[in-house]
Amino acid sequence: MSKGEELFTGVVPILVELDGDVNGHKFSVSGEGEGDATYGKLTLKFICTTGKLPVPWPTLVTTFSYGVQCFSRYPDHMKQHDFFKSAMPEGYVQERTIFFKDDGNYKTRAEVKFEGDTLVNRIELKGIDFKEDGNILGHKLEYNYNSHNVYIMADKQKNGIKVNFKIRHNIEDGSVQLADHYQQNTPIGDGPVLLPDNHYLSTQSALSKDPNEKRDHMVLLEFVTAAGITHGMDELYK
């Protein structure tokens, strides 16, 4: 068990703060909830603190919750591939470029670390080149979320990882908006981290609303499990 992994044996409170600017539309989001890495479970509620969110909530899911991949459930035989927990408590910087097919792009940068007993995800997001009446600024996405696989590989040169995946957002007319994600994570501290073999995270997310919440918001339930590495030969012959 890495030192960081010991911090995730129970339920951990999560705080998310995001400041965004998409095509000059500025907004802030605050999120609170908890994570339980034993089950790979996240429960979070996000509120736009600046009024109405100028982009669809589903376009921010990866920035919020795929930002705290340290809550992913890594099976026993894969624990030595869990970069995310090993970087704690100092944490990691997570940078992404997200290309929305036939539309603009988000550039995000987050610092994910423990502050006391709380796991904090602080994010800056800059979006450019979006069409004012496209699927994103035109709010044409359905309020739901598909399951995805998130592919992880070591980046030895930067003592971190590189991550690639394609998100499929459902559009109201029945078609799909693709969002290509290019991600890199580097540790904030200078302690040792686990550099993984290639594997993936299997994610399932459910979006809902709080009937008592008047502000623009999103409630998120998510389950994430690591997969893609089989038991070693010594395991097979036990």
């Epitope: 500025k26 802030s28 600046t50 995000t108 940068r109 602080r122 800059k126």
Partner: nanobody, 121 residues
Amino acid sequence: GGGSVQAGGSLRLSCAASGYISDSHGRNCMGWFRQAPGKEREAVARIYSRLGTTYYADSVKGRFTISRDNAKNTLYLQMHSLKPEDTAMYYCAAVGGLCIDKETPTDYPFWGQGTQVTVSS
């Protein structure tokens, strides 16, 4: 806050802004740049005021720490394990908005007058 120091030594720079520079949403990015003789001005570190998120050039990562006191409107740069190649004139700079897209000197409209840091071997 500049000065002369032996290689391996430490220095702390500070920069006080006379007014709060921000956009209409109260967002503000402050950074440190440096310029060695005959070279272009280069980014050292920057900090986004509202969230406290920080950015560092690869050459100073793990040695330098940027911080700010929002109440005093003051920016700091703590420098450890200094090397002769850190010798330069150091400038603080500020701009309203996010930090994520403020990478080059031309992104910053407000500048301090600069302080000399000399590291001898």
